[in-house]
């Protein structure tokens, strides 16, 4: 019917059973483990009220029958400055859940591809309107993954002030255009971020110690494009003490050669470089100044690519990227559809993982599992995947510590607390903690060996290439070595 909306949780893939909590101890006299969660001591700093608020919040979350049961919902606030809008001129906005006891603020930028011409923006407006208009946004959203206030789901920053900024500008958060005769749509992604930050200062952000600008997919690229600008904005407004950091999830794309070249007709199969090249003009897109100065006019699209923009950034950024990202594969026309694939496609996909790994070599804070997936940080089971035995929340905690202990300049990681975590095995899902793959017709879980064979992967040939017995190769695949 008219105006039906389906606000499902993102990341629909079934996930494996949660890993055990990071630290456990036996409850007295029971022998049963009790979960214990880290307190946000960065927010204490001698402020007893703040500390007690955290303790109370923790107590409530551990006591499900509490009369003051935690409300998980983030509440919608449309921007007071109604000139900063979504594509269709409706006011942009944000969802907020305050946490009075914390001086940490997490601002999450939603993803959802983009459009780059009147034609494909029209089509997007008629099929994905929530990504171009605020007219039908619900009053509340549930925080999941890194936006959850439950320590079990979010051992990293459960106590932070949570802000979800819906993506309704279709411009990879880069636009700075206004309504004109020429354009039926406006593209204000960069301006929306600026305005949200401005309005949050009046809601407690002014007292923040750390602002983490996070995002997934187009939102992840949006982090790379905007994090320095947010830091600059806060500095100019007189808040130089707020530490601005970035967390870019699934937004680190490559300008590699497509597996099969296609004409730039629609958003999905148009080579990303060509789409962004067209988009920048259509959106009046902005890129970070220090990056822009490295490329000649008309070549600003380069700054949408993580490996090109990252070295120019001043703020610390943690990069999360699946080595076999589904959006990258879709854009490259190499997406795995469940049909057996040709050898050429396998080699292409393996090479993609190799190229991506190379671009992360000099990114000290990174988490890149060898999985075929897309987006992770607001999935409920974001804690499950591990690289070299370390989960993403743990890696982020280590990153926090490294920044807190002024290790930014130092190349030595904290002992037992790694932050550069990039899988080295070469195939999709060679990491056994990857999100579960299911046969999409039987619903049965598949291990990596079954998955690879299902895809037409020739164990005999590959074993021969590697100089291994086929049974040995299968064993290695199943164990993720």
């Amino acid at each position: 019917g008219e105006g039906r909306k389906t606000w499902r949780r993102r990341g629909q893939q079934p996930a494996p059973a949660p890993l055990p909590p990071q630290r456990t101890e036996a409850a007295p006299g029971t022998g049963q483990p009790v979960e214990s969660f880290p307190l946000d001591f960065t927010a204490v700093e001698g402020n007893m009220d703040s500390f007690m608020a955290q303790v109370k919040s923790l107590a409530q979350s551990l006591y499900p029958c509490s009369a003051q049961q935690l409300n998980e919902d983030l509440r919608l606030h449309l921007l007071l400055n109604t000139s900063v809008t979504c594509n269709d001129g409706s006011p942009a906005g944000y969802y907020l859940k305050e946490s009075k006891g914390s001086r940490r603020w997490l601002l999450f930028l939603e993803g959802g591809w983009y459009c780059f011409s009147r034609e494909n923006c029209d089509s997007r407006y008629d099929t994905m309107r929530r990504l171009m208009s605020s007219k039908d946004w619900p009053q509340t959203r549930t925080g999941t993954g890194i936006l959850s206030s439950q320590p079990e789901e979010n051992p990293y920053w459960w106590n932070a002030n949570m802000v979800f900024i819906p993506y309704c500008s279709s411009d990879v958060w880069s636009g700075a255009s206004s309504k004109s005769e020429k354009n039926e749509y406006v593209f204000m992604g960069a301006l929306i971020i600026r305005e949200v930050v401005q309005e949050l200062l009046g809601r407690g952000l002014s007292g923040a110690k750390v602002l983490l600008l996070a995002g997934s997919s187009a939102g992840g690229t949006g982090v790379l494009l905007n994090v320095d600008r947010v830091a600059e904005q806060l500095e100019q407004l007189g808040y130089p003490a707020i530490q601005v950091r970035g967390l870019a999830d699934s937004g680190w794309f490559l300008d590699n050669k497509q597996y099969r070249r296609t004409d730039c007709v629609d958003t999905v199969t148009c080579a990303p470089t060509e789409a962004i090249r067209r988009g920048i003009r259509y959106w009046n897109g902005m890129v970070p100044e220090r990056c822009r100065s490295q490329f000649k006019e008309g070549e600003e699209w380069n700054c949408f690519l993580g490996y090109k923009v990252y070295p120019t950034l001043r703020c610390p950024v943690f990069v999360v990227q699946w080595l076999f990202d589904e959006a990258q594969l879709t854009a490259d026309n190499a997406h795995l559809t469940g049909q057996p694939v040709q050898e050429g496609q396998w080699l292409y996909i393996q090479n993609l993982g190799h190229e991506l790994r190379n671009t992360l070599k000099d990114v000290p804070a990174s988490f890149a599992p060898a999985c075929l997936s897309h987006e992770i940080i607001i999935r409920s089971h974001w804690t499950d995947v591990q690289v070299k035995g370390t989960s993403l929340p743990r890696a982020l905690h280590c990153w926090d510590r490294s920044l807190h202990d002024s290790h930014k300049a130092s190349k030595t990681p904290l002992k037992g607390c790694p932050i550069h975590l990039v899988d080295s095995c070469p195939w999709p899902h060679c990491n056994p903690s990857c999100p579960t793959i299911r046969d999409q017709f039987t619903g049965q879980e598949m291990n990596v060996a079954q998955f690879l064979m299902h895809m037409g992967f020739d164990v005999q040939t590959v074993a021969q290439q590697q100089g291994l017995e086929p049974s040995k190769l299968l064993g290695m695949l199943s164990s993720g070595s």
């Epitope: 993803g111 591809w113 034609e119 089509s123 099929t127 199969t269």
Partner: antibody, heavy 119, light 111 residues
Amino acid sequence: DVQLLESGGGLVQPGGSRKLSCAASGFTFSDFGMHWVRQAPEKGLEWVAYSSSGGTTVYYADTVKGRLTLSRDNSKNTLFLEMTSLRSEDTAMYYCARASYDGGYFDCWGQGTSLTVSS
Amino acid sequence: DIVLTQSPASLAVSLGQRATISCRASKSVSTSGYSYIHWYQQKPGQPPKLLIYLASDLESGVPARFSGSGSGAAFTLNIHPVEEEDAATYYCHHSRELPFTFGSGTKLEIK
């Protein structure tokens, strides 16, 4: 009640022309992308054309490109499909369908109008 | 263009049993947590009727024995338990990008 009503079908000679109409009621017509879908006798559904909610963008299936013109009049809540150079393979039931703007699925269909191209 | 391959072309299922219809896309039709695949039922002489939208959401008024699943490029429509009135042709449809396309249809017969 949301309703779509097609008209304009009938018997046409090969090479001839025809204009189909779809009258909408019970919803804000200008809020929705509209589509034409056809079904040849004893065959499956074939997507034919799309008109954006504002009428500024039209898109056609390759099989009909150059022979069809899609338009809409939002003030009259009507969608039009003008067909020229008709061929026998255009013989079909033509349905007008409304696409939901939160997914593009067709949540409302007309009863269809039958077009026969024959000499 | 995205090609949708539907299988089987026809199937006969006993009353009360499960009917499973599959639809495979030539490339992914999922983005941002949504899968742009929809399922319709059509009976002779009638227009199609929406059953499932966005891969797994049940259209209001449709019996709960209909369910949809899948993501990426592979999708399934399940009907369980099958009833007499479910005899019809079923189509999948994608709206991920233009041009939209339909699967070739699956004719369900009740034994």
